[in-house]
């Protein structure tokens, strides 16, 4: 089958890194600099991606593969193949149209990207707040009061108050 296909279409013999050149009786010509073909049998080469401005070259373009970009420090990739670079914020902030803004009370962000998310509502799971939340960290939920059986309690209950001047019976 491969032999038949080759006889029918000489371009199928052209490997990655070349194109099937109609100007030269369909011989395989090398992709020109700043272009590539990642598959065989192509009739043109693809123009290499340019990593400019806020984009930084992670992998150079070769005759058989496109360049790959990432973002300069202070920015992070968004989209397939790092199609966009978005500004980093500090933990405890989110990016808005007006720049980085602190998370509102009751929300947190533990990353340099993304949005502020609400603290976990411990009471929805019947649990109590063990550690309070901050702008950078979610609350830590403790065991529910029902989980604390008298014998298993790790928290010592306070001693009953005694009235002054009275001795125990």
């Amino acid at each position: 089958f491969e032999r038949t296909r080759s006889l029918q279409d000489p371009c199928s013999n052209c490997p990655a890194g070349t194109f099937c050149d109609n100007n030269r009786n369909q011989i395989c010509s090398p992709c020109p600099p700043n272009s590539f073909s990642s598959a065989g049998g192509q009739r043109t080469c693809d123009i290499c991606r340019q990593c400019k401005g806020v984009f930084r070259t992670r992998k150079e373009c070769s005759s058989t593969s496109n360049a790959e970009c990432d973002c300069t420090p202070g920015f992070h990739c968004l989209g397939a193949g790092c199609s966009m670079c978005e500004q980093d914020c500090k933990q405890g902030q989110e990016l808005t149209k007006k720049g980085c803004k602190d998370c509102c009370f009751g929300t947190f962000n533990d990353q340099k990207r993304g949005i502020c998310r609400p603290w976990t509502n411990c009471s929805l799971d019947g649990k109590s707040v063990l550690v309070n939340g901050t702008k950078e960290r979610d609350v830590v939920c403790g065991p529910s009061p029902a989980d604390l059986s008298p014998g298993a309690s790790s928290v010592t209950p306070p001693a009953p108050a005694r009235e002054p001047g009275h001795s125990p019976q």
Epitope: F19, N34, C45
Partner: nanobody
Amino acid sequence: EVQLLESGGGLVQPGGSLRLSCAASGFTLSHEDVGWVRQAPGKGLEWVSAILDSGGSTYYAESVKGRFTISRDNAKNTLYLQMSSLRAEDTAVYYCARYVYHAGGGVTFDTRGQGTQVTVSS
């Protein structure tokens, strides 16, 4: 009509130098992506060097880096390839090439001239 006329080739001893010229007509060289390809005896085409209009950045094949220099004279509409420290493996027909950009986003190249023969031999 677009034409590319190469000249400057010849017989040179190893270690010697040559300067190839490519006179362009029918288009403005300074507005185009252009370069040099070569074909050694019994071999396929190989890109040697290119100069890209966007910023004038240059490309050189690893085998010629540090030995060949591409340049252009916009006033004369001419492309040059200065070749020094020539080696036997540089023996080839050298063609001036012009990038051809296609509507679908692809790119190929065009060599309209007859090329100029460079032979490096003692």
